[in-house]
């Protein structure tokens, strides 16, 4: 058993049929010695008396809020949560496996630039009685500070018969130099509590590997005289690291109709303009990627050919 | 010719071309190592990230773009005193401390060149003959060093009398390649910045 936060404790259980469970001793936080009784959750049934209560925790019915009272007055609470371990593996029931970029990916993180600011998100089908808390650091043995905000519900989607909820959190490395060469990864730890179930999820990454620039901005078209070619120009996204001559981007320019199966024109360039062939009912799209370290491409920025 | 000087013509800065070749060659070699050594811990997640130039050179700091010198997090790292020392102090803001920066890059290349050559000599003794260093990568390191055109003491190639542990050597190769790729990215960024200055 360990303390998650004040008056909240996590009991780690090997989860298999007829498992013996864990013996837990709860102590009432009071100077009083006599006349103390214990109850669980909303029940008025007295579980025991005395300053300490010894219980055998085997299942979720044994978890919950234990309260010690004296003469009708509440003295203190202890909330017991369960963390299940099945076949030596901690349970991952609360969050959905996003399977990208690989299986068992529960947390996904992205950074728009090298400032040390990043966003992580996760998915769940659970809609109520759910709380998250996020901690992060650079390195684990001698951790350097990363500050994370509160996790918030950022999107709701319908997937077949199920509703899916996306939560996200923003974090900022306390003292980040955009030009630094990372040798210690960022560690992100998410504590998830659903009712009386506790789970924890972690992710470890270098900012350089989670870079995904915003799409290029200000796409403009200029038809070329006596030609089907069009000059398309754009600018670096505002959120990208500066100076741009140091943090350079490379671009992919594509002309395509509405369907992915349609024919297309595609060209790669390090410049902020390119010449392509425009077709009726097609769109010109441009996306960006770090020129020197191939992490993710940005989403497309698009303008219609017409 | 002593130091490459940034001029308006992008083709006039030879180091830019060489640094782009360097990054491509290292990335290519790293990809090859990851494929060939698929049963060794050779991915970014699996290896320890070591920097053989740590406390010996200061490329990131010496080559900081002017725009980032206002960022205290970029200056309070290991070599601040080195940055503001010596004859470059007066021209710090205007010259991007080019000489110090390029000499630091040169020293990086020299250290990696020695490590890679030593390692290749060991790998050539491996009866499995599983992986060798790409001669193109070694040539590109050499070309960039020549373009930088610094004179410095030659570092003797390390020779080891004991029987090489090929497993350890291959893991060390992965560690070196990962670190060198990160440094090659920095070098490419620096050359691009200098070329645009």
């Amino acid at each position: 058993i360990w303390e998650l936060k004040k008056d909240v404790y996590v009991v780690e259980l090997d989860w298999y049929p007829d498992a013996p469970g864990e013996m837990v001793v709860l102590t009432c936080d009071t100077p009083e010695e006599d006349g103390i009784t214990w109850t669980l959750d909303q029940s008025s049934e007295v579980l025991g008396s005395g300053k300490t209560l010894t219980i055998q925790v085997k299942e979720f019915g044994d978890a919950g809020q234990y309260t010690c009272h004296k003469g009708g007055e509440v003295l203190s609470h202890s909330l017991l949560l369960l963390h299940k371990k099945e076949d030596g593996i901690w349970s991952t029931d609360i969050l959905k496996d996003q399977k990208e970029p690989k299986n068992k990916t529960f947390l996904r993180c992205e950074a728009k630039n090298y400032s040390g600011r990043f966003t992580c998100w996760w998915l769940t089908t659970i809609s109520t009685d759910l709380t998250f808390s996020v901690k992060s650091s650079r390195g684990s043995s001698d951790p350097q500070g990363v500050t994370c905000g509160a996790a918030t519900l950022s999107a709701e989607r319908v997937r077949g018969d199920n509703k899916e909820y996306e939560y996200s959190v923003e974090c900022q490395e306390d003292s980040a130099c955009p030009a630094a060469e990372e040798s210690l990864p960022i560690e992100v730890m998410v504590d998830a509590v659903h009712k009386l179930k506790y789970e924890n999820y972690t992710s470890s990454f270098f900012i350089r590997d989670i870079i995904k620039p915003d799409p290029p901005k200000n796409l403009q078209l200029k038809p070329l005289k006596n030609s089907r070619q069009v000059e398309v120009s754009w600018e670096y996204p505002d959120t990208w690291s500066t100076p741009h001559s140091y943090f350079s981007l490379t671009f992919c320019v594509q002309v395509q109709g509405k369907s992915k199966r349609e024919k297309k024109d595609r060209v790669f360039t390090d410049k902020t303009s390119a010449t392509v062939i425009c077709r009726k009912n097609a769109s010109i799209s441009v996306r960006a990627q770090d020129r020197y370290y191939s992490s993710s491409w940005s989403e497309w920025a698009s303008v219609p050919c017409s | 010719r002593n130091l490459p000087v940034a001029t308006p013509d992008p083709g006039m800065f030879p180091c830019l071309h060489h640094s782009q070749n360097l990054l491509r060659a290292v990335s290519n070699m790293l990809q090859k190592a990851r494929q060939t050594l698929e049963f060794y811990p050779c991915t970014s997640e699996e290896i320890d990230h070591e920097d053989i130039t740590k406390d010996k050179t200061s490329t990131v700091e010496a080559c900081l773009p002017l725009e980032l010198t206002k960022n205290e997090s970029c200056l309070n790292s290991r070599e601040t005193s080195f940055i503001t020392n010596g004859s470059c102090l007066a021209s710090r803001k205007t010259s991007f401390m080019m000489a110090l920066c390029l000499s630091s890059i040169y020293e990086d290349l020299k250290m990696y060149q020695v490590e890679f050559k030593t390692m290749n000599a060991k790998l050539l003794m491996d009866p499995k003959r599983q992986i060798f260093l790409d001669q193109n990568m070694l040539a590109v390191i050499d070309e960039l060093m020549q373009a930088l055109n610094f004179n410095s003491e030659t570092v003797p190639q390390k020779s080891s009398l004991e029987e090489p542990d090929f497993y350890k050597t291959k893991i060390k190769l992965c560690i070196l390649l990962h670190a060198f790729r990160i440094r090659a990215v920095t070098i490419d960024r620096v050359m691009s910045y200098l070329n645009a200055s």
Partner: antibody, heavy 118, light 107 residues
Framework: EVQLVQSGAEVKKPGATVKISCKAS????????LHWVRQRPEKGLEWMGW????????EYAPKFQGKVTITADTSTDTGYLELSSLRSEDTAVYYC???????????WGQGTLVTVSS | DIQMTQSPSSVSASVGDRVTITCRAS??????LHWYQQKPGKAPKLLIK???QSISGVPSRFSGYGSGTDFSLTINSLQPEDFARYYC?????????FGGGTKVEIK
Amino acid sequence: EVQLVQSGAEVKKPGATVKISCKASGYTFSDYYLHWVRQRPEKGLEWMGWIDPENGDTEYAPKFQGKVTITADTSTDTGYLELSSLRSEDTAVYYCAANKELRYFDVWGQGTLVTVSS
Amino acid sequence: DIQMTQSPSSVSASVGDRVTITCRASQSISINLHWYQQKPGKAPKLLIKFASQSISGVPSRFSGYGSGTDFSLTINSLQPEDFARYYCQQSNSFPLTFGGGTKVEIK
């Protein structure tokens, strides 16, 4: 299977015109761009131009402008290359090539040899 | 027009050898470079697109590399069926242009 089948070899006199064909099968003809590429004896490849069969849009390499005309007939899934004012230096194998992407060539015809000789 | 220069114009090699062909553009073309193989009397065949992207059905011994102005095609362990002529082609701008070709011959 995506295939391009070209018409047979042609022998022409200088000053004449020749029209060679390229029949597409295994895909929707208007879904791919169609290009023509020339290869003179013992020489390299030269791109001549392309057509978008969907709308008839064409683009020619400057060196072939006025010399060649590229057309397409969607009713027969066939592309055509017409060469006018033939000279001995037009003796070459002419390939049609197609792709969903405009700028490179995924599928090739077998080639048509055009010989210009008096 | 962008000029594409291939070297060497021919190379003699044995089965099992590693062969590298280079292609240089007269100006930067990013990764807009494609490689083709042509056997005598046959049409060219696409091997690599956009400098390094593999084509399905093409053996993995063929690999492409480069960006900007310098590119290379490597055949890792030469097979009897690889003796042919190889061409690079730029798609950075029209007109599309090819290199002069490199003939890989049996030593």
